[in-house]
Interface confidence: medium
Amino acid sequence: ECVTQLLKDTCFEGGDITTVFTPSAKYCQVVCTYHPRCLLFTFTAESPSEDPTRWFTCVLKDSVTETLPRVNRTAAISGYSFKQCSHQISACNKDIYVDLDMKGINYNSSVAKSAQECQERCTDDVHCHFFTYATRQFPSLEHRNICLLKHTQTGTPTRITKLDKVVSGFSLKSCALSNLACIRDIFPNTVFADSNIDSVMAPDAFVCGRICTHHPGCLFFTFFSQEWPKESQRNLCLLKTSESGLPSTRIKKSKALSGFSLQSCRHSIPVFCHSSFYHDTDFLGEELDIVAAKSHEACQKLCTNAVRCQFFTYTPAQASCNEGKGKCYLKLSSNGSPTKILHGRGGISGYTLRLCKMDNECTTKIKPRIVGGTASVRGEWPWQVTLHTTSPTQRHLCGGSIIGNQWILTAAHCFYGVESPKILRVYSGILNQSEIKEDTSFFGVQEIIIHDQYKMAESGYDIALLKLETTVNYTDSQRPICLPSKGDRNVIYTDCWVTGWGYRKLRDKIQNTLQKAKIPLVTNEECQKRYRGHKITHKMICAGYREGGKDACKGDSGGPLSCKHNEVWHLVGITSWGEGCAQRERPGVYTNVVEYVDWILEKTQAVEQKLISEEDLGGEQKLISEEDLHHHHHH
């Protein structure tokens, strides 16, 4: 059962797994959610009635019954992990904590103009988990404006103390705000010879990489495959770090694979969701339950529905036994990974899908697309929306993309002459415009947010957000697309598509069926040559064939330029402008979305921020951001 509210002056008795320090009860709840075993927690707030050494302690707890006895205690705040809930979860924490010093290893000290600059420095430093910044009012003159970058083994502070005139906060890597590059390759026959911070068992290098990505100290990893000569090390995933942040030595070894943490682009990759099945593979661990199941898929469902189940092994039924049902072994361990992996015993193993909600909804695999043809099929581009105006009569105005459960990203130039959001309607899950009747459900627009530097499409900043009046329930036909990661700025996208109901040629009409065209990206240098009279800036991206013939056109504006990278679709561009349509040597010009990620996050969160008073949170006064962008969903 999902319980989101916090229980004030309440302490859960027993069930302790470990104690960490967090600056708030809300963050304690997030830490509990991301911990492999934590189901409940008790946080101790700052209070005169409590021993100061116990302030800010966050005790993570587990219970076979999923609950524990409650005891009244002043300053204690208790609650449940979000593992039991179905909504999206995010580790992103933008809050700044005033007069708190979060202790850790201070590995870097420098002068910064503001706490925001200090936080940005932390976000762009590979080792940084959190920071403390001494403000201008700090009593000690030589420490004023000093930004301390910190890290710990767990990613959370080793202690938190009260300290006047300092502020503290966390790295925003998990908010998709890091400029650190993502090295997505997995290198075969390679061992990284650096210090191991941890080791777990994993069925393949991809799972090992995902474990590394969400492990606070892991910067890169080495995985020994099941063919590795040393039996005791088979399926071993070594989580590694180094002072420089890079592997110091690569050793060539057959049957080993190595790669990097993708922490700075984790919003656009599945990290917790290990959805594959591993055949002829047994996962060992603590047994939770043994139940009969018809198939390994059914066994995975049972594991997903059992809140404490982390992974499973299914042994298919012998021909005539048990009505064709096999045995489903539901299992768990201290770290969420099998304690050993065995092969050749006929089992089929896998992981719970309960943790998939900790990944961005936009990373969910969509149905395979139909290659060839120009007309799309239903569900092929589930983030594509059609934006209608009702004035003077109802018509398709522009395209747009779902990027969050209340947010559409589109082009600013679509709103020329649009006086009020009241005349706008957003239709999602639409393939044919003819489906839209008077009674077709739509989303009203609460607010139009146009980039304040926008003047005209050709001069850039052609980007706008629509805040919807109601939230989108994600289904196969309507779901978000991932924003590109700032860490992926150097990625060369090769599988890009433009979609829309726009004209197929100049002097045409809006198409009934959603059209699609695969279009290659063009370098900005090349694009600039084709548009001598315009300035093609780094905030624009161009796409098109030299010979013309395929392009976005009138009515496609605001729609997506969607590129598939590592099995995940990214919103690389927003259809903006071009000379004619599909003309020879005149590529289409798109808003380069990666350059606006900060702006998007700032706008989508500014609308949501509200101050929660001291009374609301039992003595904690701070800013809580209720994020609902696709990688910052409502709690």
């Epitope: 090295i183 010879a193 890079l246 030595t249 690569r250 050793i251 060539k252 070894k253 150097n490």
Partner: antibody, heavy 119, light 108 residues
Framework: QVQLVESGGGVVQPGRSLRLSCAAS????????MHWVRQTPGKGLEWVAL????????YSGDSVKGRFTISRDNSKSTLYLQMNSLTAEDTAVYYC????????????WGQGTMVTVSS | DIQMTQSPSSLSASVGDRVTITCRAS??????LNWYQQKPGKAPKLLIY???SLQSGVPSRFSGSGSGTDFTLTISSLQPEDFATYYC??????????FGQGTRLEIK
């Protein structure tokens, strides 16, 4: 065909700087790891520095660490070696080389550019 | 760092001879060893990679063998164009990448 062309060599005084360039053509430069290797007159080959295909990882040999910086511009298909605080021991022919095959072997080489450090 | 030692450092041979050059690594490098040929005033050229695989375009009279610490380059029947300096190089533990000191093959 695959080609690497170095430039920027010459005579320079000790303590001064020099920047070598290597222009690549005939292959997708941005996909491959690139290196600089040098050869002092009448001597053997010495590895100098490497850079990963996307510029994310850079390494250099102990003898040049902190003085030489390898970089690349994939949009120009060009590799660079910025050499600072040069000494007489840095006098050598500098080769730009790459690994384009599946094995870690230098299968493409430039013709080399001579750097002479002398007062 | 892994040290590579070649022997001999120079050798004289005649056209048609069978020639063997050896290379020893200071620790096991599996089969991550490459051989290069260099002619005066020219850049090195890859002959053999992964200890025994012949690079495309290289005549079949060149062959490589060995694994662990001991490797050999063999030229089965020396041709006039084979007189050059030969280098071995390990790609097992990198960086640094290390080369042997070279073997100069000259006409007797």
């Amino acid at each position: 065909q695959v080609q690497l062309v170095e430039s920027g060599g010459g005579v320079v005084q000790p303590g001064r700087s020099l920047r070598l360039s290597c222009a690549a053509s005939g292959f997708t430069f941005s996909n491959y790891e690139m290196h600089w290797v040098r050869q002092t007159p009448g001597k053997g080959l010495e590895w100098v520095a490497l850079i990963w295909y996307d510029g994310s990882n850079k390494y250099s040999g102990d003898s040049v660490k902190g003085r030489f910086t390898i970089s690349r511009d994939n949009s120009k298909s060009t590799l660079y070696l910025q050499m600072n605080s040069l000494t007489a021991e840095d006098t050598a022919v500098y080769y730009c080389t790459g690994i384009t095959g599946t094995e870690d072997a230098f299968d493409v080489w430039g013709q080399g550019t001579m750097v002479t450090v002398s007062s | 760092d892994i040290q590579m030692t070649q022997s001999p450092s120079s050798l004289s041979a005649s056209v048609g001879d069978r020639v063997t050059i050896t290379c020893r690594a200071s620790q096991s490098i599996s089969s991550y060893l490459n051989w290069y040929q260099q002619k005066p005033g020219k850049a090195p050229k890859l002959l053999i990679y992964a200890a025994s695989s012949l690079q495309s375009g290289v005549p079949s009279r060149f062959s490589g063998s060995g694994s662990g610490t001991d490797f050999t380059l063999t030229i089965s029947s020396l041709q006039p164009e084979d007189f050059a300096t030969y280098y071995c190089q390990q790609s097992y533990s990198t960086p640094p990448i290390t080369f042997g000191q070279g073997t100069r093959l000259e006409i007797k």
